[in-house]
């Protein structure tokens, strides 16, 4: 992909970013008593930037080398590297910084595809797993719950580790871990269902390490519009991986004649990707893209980080909005195929299903729509935000809010259309999901703007935790519970099976509207919280060690 090949060049705002980074370097040069010469902002041949820390030269290949500092009392003051043109300057390698970072982003995105491919391969062969192990629906629910709960619990732990230790090592270990567990789980004997449950829990832990840390590395490789673009690519991996997971699950099962083989594909790819991450992803410093180099040290405790995040209103509101998205996608993903099947039974275009899988065709269509709308949503959201940033500083949360509120309308229309037209319902699903998914990458970008680099992994983890806890961990069960409750008070008929589930699912658009409100609330505080984060970053770049953040 061209956009990955040379990301910094492809992004429309690349020149603007360069100028912005240049201004920041000059400003810091002045702050650090460089005599106002701006030597810290000096650029070497081919445009190698000297980091704000003054002790590193970032080469075009993305590598970092120690820069010579002049002896005390010389013009090359401590904390300000010699200019690239001056004596003693090291000439950077003539390779492309954009290409190195682009490759890193590509590998990280590939890893995210695999994360979701692995997760949804299991979903793709879930009926076979249920059949083989004799798993009841409550057992299948347990598999899902254990995965989400372990993911939720592990996310904050990896957030803490990700802000303090080598991130690419944690990432690779996480991938190697879930790959090994998934591969092993394909050999679990029929009588050890509890081992399968445990393996899903362990996979959840392994995948939490990735989902929590990878976006923060992208955040440290890029800024502004390029970062939005790269996060869009990264988050497009979710619908792509999910769709590929279903496809892999069913096609490998058919090709091999045994569902066990489906669980052996993603681990092999995972091992390769884990190795590529170790080799190709640079060990970036936190705040690297913000030209902060070595200066950002995690001096704060986890408790202080948590307090700061909870006080960050943009972060809190955007996290609650993310939970609303998660609630809706979790519930719709589980129940819409069955709802549409029941709609067809009412319309007399399908038979009542007594032997599952019920609505297998609808699941397939819904899966394909989700995959495509995921892509369309991410692209639309990123494009809209980019355009709106020219008009307002609050573009990010406002685009999300509009997407959410628009999505709620079309989700409501699904239940109106389904009574008479399945095609109409699918069109509403298509538009509704596109709008709902448009905020994926933008939400991640909001987080990058309002949270300082040394807290980003913790912030991503906490957001992941809350969005699962308040979102998809409970929504499928809540919808099922409400549907059963309605059915208990009505007569047993295909019409009421359809209506009760429809009424229960009507909770989703209300939650999505609530999410839109949370994004509007984010818009209120976004500018001030972003400015505060930038101010804190600038403070962190100054010499005094005891900067309170």
């Amino acid at each position: 992909m061209m956009c990955l090949e040379c990301a910094s060049a492809a992004a429309g705002g690349a020149e603007e970013e360069e100028a912005d980074a240049e201004r920041r370097r000059r400003r810091r040069g002045a702050q650090r008593g460089a005599g106002g010469s701006g030597c810290c902002g000096a650029r070497g041949a081919g445009g190698a930037g000297v980091s704000a820390a003054g002790d590193e030269v970032q080469t075009l290949s993305g590598s970092v080398r120690r820069a010579p500092t002049g002896p005390p009392g010389t013009p090359g003051t401590p904390g300000c590297a010699a200019t690239a043109k001056g004596p003693g300057a090291q000439q950077p390698k003539p390779a492309s910084l954009g290409r190195g970072r682009g490759a890193a982003a590509a590998i990280l995105s590939l890893g995210n595809v695999l994360n979701y491919l692995d997760r949804y391969t299991v979903a793709g062969v879930l009926l076979d797993i249920q059949q083989h192990f004799g798993v009841k629906d409550r057992g299948a629910g347990l598999l899902q719950s254990v995965f989400i709960c372990s993911f939720m619990v592990a996310a904050p732990i990896f957030g803490y580790l990700g802000d303090r230790f080598n991130r690419k090592v944690i990432l690779s270990c996480g991938i190697f871990f879930w790959s090994a567990v998934t591969f092993s789980s394909s050999f679990i004997p029929q009588q050890y269902f509890w081992l399968l449950v445990a393996s899903r829990g362990l996979v959840g832990i392994g995948e939490a390490s990735y989902s929590t840390i990878a976006p923060t590395i992208i955040g440290d490789l890029f800024t502004k519009n390029t970062r939005t673009l790269m996060l869009s690519v990264f988050y497009f991996a979710i619908p792509l991986g999910s769709g590929l997971g279903y496809i892999t699950g069913s096609s490998v099962k058919q090709a091999a004649g045994d569902w066990h083989w489906a669980l052996r594909v993603s681990p092999v790819l995972g091992m390769i990707t884990g190795t590529l991450i170790l080799i190709l992803v640079p060990a970036t410093k936190r705040g690297h893209a913000d030209q902060l180099g070595d200066q950002l040290k995690a001096r704060t405790s986890w408790l202080r980080d948590m307090k700061a995040l909870i006080r960050n209103r943009s972060y809190v509101f955007s996290s609650l909005a993310t939970s609303a998205v998660s609630f809706a996608t979790g519930a719709l993903g589980m129940w819409i195929p069955l709802y549409l099947h029941r709609a067809q039974v009412v319309q007399k275009t399908a038979e009542t299903c007594n032997s599952p899988p019920c609505g297998a065709k609808d699941s397939l269509i819904f899966g394909a729509i989700t995959c495509f709308t995921g892509f369309l949503g991410v692209v639309t959201g990123a494009g809209a935000t980019r355009w709106c940033r020219l008009k307002t500083q609050r573009a990010d949360p406002l685009v999300c809010a509009v997407g959410m509120l628009g999505s709620a309308i079309f989700i409501c229309l699904i239940f109106v259309a389904a009574k008479s037209s399945i095609v109409g319902a699918y069109i509403c699903i298509f538009v509704g999901e596109t709008l709902l998914f448009s905020n994926w990458a933008i939400t991640a970008d909001i987080l990058m703007y309002v949270v300082i680099p040394t807290r980003r992994a913790t912030a991503v983890a906490l957001q992941s935790f809350t969005s699962h806890l308040l979102g998809d961990a409970g929504s499928p069960y809540l919808i099922g519970f409400i549907s059963d409750l309605i059915r208990q008070s009505t007569k047993d008929s295909p019409l009421w099976e359809f209506l009760s589930l429809g009424y229960a699912l009507m909770l989703c658009p209300f939650v999505v509207v609530l999410g839109g409100m949370f994004f509007l609330a984010t818009a209120l505080f976004f500018v001030s919280d972003r400015a505060r984060a930038e101010q804190q970053v600038n403070q962190l770049a100054m010499p005094p060690a005891s900067v309170k953040v």
């Epitope: 059949q131 192990f133 004799g134 798993v135 009841k136």
Partner: antibody, heavy 125, light 107 residues
Framework: EVQLVETGGGLVRPGSSLKLSCATS????????MSWVRQAPGKGLEWVAL??????????NYAESIKGRFTISRDDSKSRVYLQMNTLRDQDTATYYC????????????????WGQGVMVTVSS | DIVLTQSPPTLSVTPGESVSLSCRAS??????IHWYQQRSNESPRLLIK???QSIAGIPSRFSGSGSGTDFILSINRVESEDFSVYYC?????????FGPGTKLEVK
């Protein structure tokens, strides 16, 4: 004590129908998978049909030899499982056993931990 | 469908002897094999589940082993009540299938 008692057997003509019933007691029937297994005179055992519990949508599975002719069903309120046999053939002559699958709440074993005493079905003209 | 083959079809032993009954699957089935005993004019009863797991109330002289395609039911010191037909059953995949049985008779 777990008990499975089959009824409804007898002599019928080819092409006719018969409904076997299995009354159960001593365990939580609504959570348990049930099967019918048959044994032709002097022959081995053959699994016929399986019905899962309501937590598995009461899904039914059948042996290829009887698919489309036999229907397994259950009535949780009466703790009974049934086998409706239509278009009976000579080769359906056998002792039909009602069997229970061992239950583990979240999942179930496919083996049979309890068997009824069996009921004889003879298909002959 | 998975086909199970039991050998020998008939096995003649004297009480007190130890015997091994074999069951072979047409494809690898891990440990998803179960053994049943059917005495004359009685219903079958479960002896061993998942190749080697013992069942409550079944004498300890019955044991099972094997994995993949080859399985063994061992009876240590056969007693008079053990002379019956023994069936293996696979639960690796539907349809559930039984072996043709091995008849254990008095020599």
């Amino acid at each position: 004590e777990v008990q499975l008692v089959e009824t409804g057997g007898g002599l019928v003509r080819p092409g006719s129908s018969l409904k076997l019933s299995c009354a159960t007691s001593g365990f939580t029937f609504s959570d348990t998978w049930m099967s019918w297994v048959r044994q032709a005179p002097g022959k081995g055992l053959e699994w016929v049909a399986l019905i899962k519990d309501k937590n598995s949508n009461s899904e039914a599975n059948y042996a290829e030899s009887i698919k489309g002719r036999f229907t397994i069903s259950r009535d949780d309120s009466k703790s009974r499982v049934y086998l409706q046999m239509n278009t009976l053939r000579d080769q359906d002559t056998a002792t039909y056993y009602c069997t229970r699958h061992e239950d583990f709440y979240y999942y179930s074993g496919y083996y049979f931990d309890y068997w009824g005493q069996g009921v004889m079905v003879t298909v002959s003209s | 469908d998975i086909v199970l083959t039991q050998s020998p079809p008939t096995l003649s032993v004297t009480p007190g002897e130890s015997v091994s009954l074999s069951c072979r699957a047409s494809q690898g089935i891990s440990t998803s094999i179960h053994w049943y005993q059917q005495r004359s004019n009685e219903s079958p009863r479960l002896l061993i589940k998942y190749a080697s797991q013992s069942i409550a109330g079944i004498p300890s002289r019955f044991s099972g082993s094997g994995s993949g395609t080859d399985f063994i039911l061992s009876i240590n010191r056969v007693e008079s009540e053990d002379f019956s037909v023994y069936y293996c059953q696979q639960t690796y995949s539907l349809p559930l299938t039984f072996g043709p049985g091995t008849k254990l008779e008095v020599k």
